[in-house]
Interface confidence: low
């Protein structure tokens, strides 16, 4: 370990701390008998700035004038080099380069709350790179002065720890901050203020809300404030909204009535306070109060649709469907739906409450005129009922919309277009577009979707509950009074070739021809709407091209005759299915020979 500066000294003039741009003289001198042995003129003193040589001199001392030192700390080390030996460290010095403090700017003071303490902030200006002390001085009436010092190099905030009181709210106080370092000092412009200027009230607390008679129209917000508060700002918004409603109130004394709240909505409320109309500053916003407004009876009416299904000569099945009310219409939690079914001529009626579902199915006679009414109920009451006369929606052929088409429109959308019916188009009161997944069995449990369209529209974009690679049965109804006409089409939003072909399950012989029966392709393998089936056949062990028969796809069809087979010839048969995107792979192969020789 080097015994530092035992062999010599490094002195710095004028000082170890210098102003940026100043010149400094560095002297390195050897103590007596500390040079190289024998010949002092062989002493070679070398001055390093950090680890870079900047000067050298033969003799007992070295003088170096250094300029252009950067802001911050620079280390100088003096070393002695003798012949045939390593350099020996003599001594060193750090030089600190900085600037005098700039004038502190934008001095401002605040007292948080009537019981708080005065604290001030300012902008320091550029970094001095030296230790700089800040002194904050506050002078008030009756020659009172307070002083506080800051020992943090980045000091731009000080709390006096004193409390200004409202006894003389108009009394003037003056604050000033002074920055001092070894290169100079600078003071801010004085900041003069009164109690009312700098006291920022504490945010209101203990916020509560009261709904008189559980009604949203009689709502009062309560809170507590510091004693001198004159003004309040209230802001409130539904919890799912980003926009605030703002209200300014004077002399509220901790309460305010709110008149425009929506029912059954969670709101967030905040309040801020101020001591004077035009002096001082607003408090921070209070902590949020979250509260749900009471329910009100539902508004609006349910959108109801229905489906009829023939059961036998005397009975029919009616399935009713309805859509949930929007949140703003429901105005509360819907507890149940009330469905009333009425026979209009005989006056028979039945009412049922439905919970947890938005559909209802019943069986009624095929005779009589039937109507239904559906309403939604919450804890405060019921919506107006939606009334529908049950009719045969497709009975009026002249009301059937024409040229219905369904085309894919981007991801999971289908554009349905049609032409008005031949019968006077002005008779149409509305169109209803209905769609449901196509299931070969005609399954009534498949969810039904619908939308209503104005009578002047001839297209509708359907996107709700539309999945890729699924075929939908789409119906367009034209409704006019108690009559309706309909047209249907199959459509998909996206399609591919089917993943498999139909499975032939039986081949039977009938009067010289054969009847082929097959199982439908599973829905998840159809990959869209099927357009055709193809039946292929060729003689067993033959290399000839197969013959084929193409059958347009119909939902219920699963058999087809072929009468072009030769007797006593063994044939191989198979089937494929086609969508607009292409043909499936082969289904299973079956061999068959006419005249009872089937395998």
């Amino acid at each position: 370990k080097i015994d530092a500066c035992k062999r010599g000294d490094v002195t710095v003039k004028p000082s170890h701390v210098i102003l940026l741009g100043s010149t400094v003289n560095i002297t390195c001198s050897l103590k007596p008998r500390q040079g190289c042995f024998h010949y002092s003129r062989r002493n070679k003193l070398i001055l390093y700035k950090f680890d870079r040589r900047i000067n050298f001199h033969h003799g007992h001392s070295l003088n170096s004038q250094v300029t252009g030192l950067p802001l911050g700390t620079t280390l100088f080390v003096c070393k002695l080099a003798c012949i045939n030996s390593d350099e020996i460290q003599i001594c060193g010095a750090e030089i600190f380069v900085g600037v005098a403090p700039e004038q502190p700017q934008n001095l401002s003071c605040i007292q948080k709350g009537e019981q708080g303490t005065v604290a001030c902030t300012w902008e320091r200006g550029r970094d001095t790179h030296l230790y700089t002390e800040y002194t904050l001085q506050l002078s008030g009436p009756k020659n009172l002065t307070w002083q506080k010092q800051c020992k943090d190099i980045y000091c731009d905030y000080l709390d006096f720890g004193i409390n200004l009181t409202p006894e003389s709210p108009e009394s003037n106080f003056t604050a000033k901050v002074t920055a001092v370092n070894s290169l100079g000092s600078s003071s801010s412009l004085p900041s003069t203020f009164t109690f009312l200027d700098i006291v920022r009230p504490l945010p209101p607390w203990d916020i509560r809300i009261k709904f008189q008679k559980a009604s949203v129209s009689r709502c009062t917000l309560y809170w507590r404030d510091e004693g001198l508060v004159l003004l309040n700002r209230l802001r409130y918004r539904p919890s799912n909204s980003r926009l605030w409603n703002m209200v300014n109130v004077t002399k509220a004394k901790g309460r305010h009535d709110l008149l425009d709240l929506k029912p059954f909505t969670e709101y967030e409320f905040q309040i801020s306070s101020k001591l004077h109309l035009y002096k001082g500053s607003w408090s921070d916003w209070s902590e949020s109060l979250r509260a749900q407004t009471p329910e009100e009876e539902p508004t609006g009416m349910l959108d109801v649709w229905y489906m009829k299904r023939h059961i036998d000569y005397s009975r029919q099945q009616i399935s009713l469907f309805w859509k949930n009310l929007s949140v703003s219409e429901a105005r509360g939690k819907i507890l149940h739906y009330q469905v009333t079914l009425q026979e209009l001529t005989g006056g028979k009626a039945m009412t049922q409450n439905i919970t947890g579902h938005t559909s209802w199915t019943t069986v009624i006679p095929r005779t009589g005129n039937w109507a239904v009414a559906v309403s939604a109920a919450n804890s405060k009451g019921s919506s107006l009922p939606t009334r529908i006369n049950i009719m045969n929606l497709c009975e009026a052929g002249l009301l059937a919309p024409r040229q219905v088409s369904a085309n894919s429109e981007g991801m999971d959308n289908i554009l349905v277009t049609w032409q008005p019916p031949r019968k006077d188009p002005s008779a149409v009161q509305e169109y209803v577009v209905e769609w449901r997944e196509l299931h070969p069995g005609g399954d009534t449990q498949v969810p039904l979707n619908w939308l209503r369209s104005r009578p002047y529209n001839v297209s509708a974009l359907i996107s709700e509950n539309i999945k890729s690679y699924i075929c939908y049965e789409i119906r367009v109804y034209a409704l006019s009074g108690d009559q309706g006409g309909c047209s249907s089409i199959l459509g998909n939003s996206k399609h591919k070739a089917p993943l498999s072909g139909p499975h032939i399950n039986a081949i039977t012989e009938e009067k010289g021809s054969i009847l082929i029966s097959w199982n439908s392709i599973p829905v998840q393998e159809q990959m869209g709407c099927l357009l055709h089936y193809r039946i292929y056949w060729k003689e067993r062990d033959s290399n000839s091209q197969p013959q084929l028969c193409e059958i347009p796809y119909r939902v219920s069809q699963n058999s087809h005759p072929i009468n072009s087979l030769q007797p006593r010839v063994t044939y191989v048969l198979w089937m494929t299915a086609l969508t607009a995107a292409g043909e499936s792979s082969h289904g299973n192969e079956r061999e068959f020979c006419l005249q009872g020789k089937a395998n």
């Epitope: 700390t73 230790y131 190099i153």
Partner: nanobody, 115 residues
Framework: QVQLQESGGGSVQPGWSLRLTCAAS????????MHWFRQAPGKGLEWVSS????????YYTDSVKGRITISRDNAKNTLYLQLNDLKSEDTAVYYC????????RGQGTQVTVSS
């Protein structure tokens, strides 16, 4: 965070000695150059002495050379300042610092020299 705690100050007569200690934590002491500053009553902060991280290089302000010795024990994370032949003008609060501007420093220890 960086913590520096000075101790060892006191009231002494001129010519006496004191050894000041600075206990450091919250940073890698063994790789940091360390510094002593002092502030006399009514004066600004004055740099006194510095020592390199390994302890091999030491520096002193001209007014204290020969009377003051800076040293360190990296194993104990401790910095020392030996004050000999104390004079009345050495009366001040002494601070140890991690940086040469004196920004990161402790609370200080009071040294009072009077007869």
């Amino acid at each position: 965070q960086v913590q520096l705690q000075e101790s060892g100050g006191g009231s002494v007569q001129p010519g006496w000695s004191l050894r000041l200690t600075c206990a450091a934590s919250g940073f890698t002491f063994s790789t940091s150059g360390m510094h002593w500053f002092r502030q006399a009553p009514g004066k600004g902060l004055e740099w006194v002495s510095s020592i390199s991280s390994g302890g091999g290089d030491t520096y002193y302000t001209d007014s204290v050379k020969g009377r003051i010795t800076i040293s360190r024990d990296n194993a104990k994370n401790t910095l020392y300042l030996q004050l000999n032949d104390l004079k009345s003008e050495d009366t001040a609060v002494y601070y140890c610092s991690k940086d040469p501007s004196g920004a990161t420093r402790g609370q200080g220890t009071q040294v009072t020299v009077s007869s």
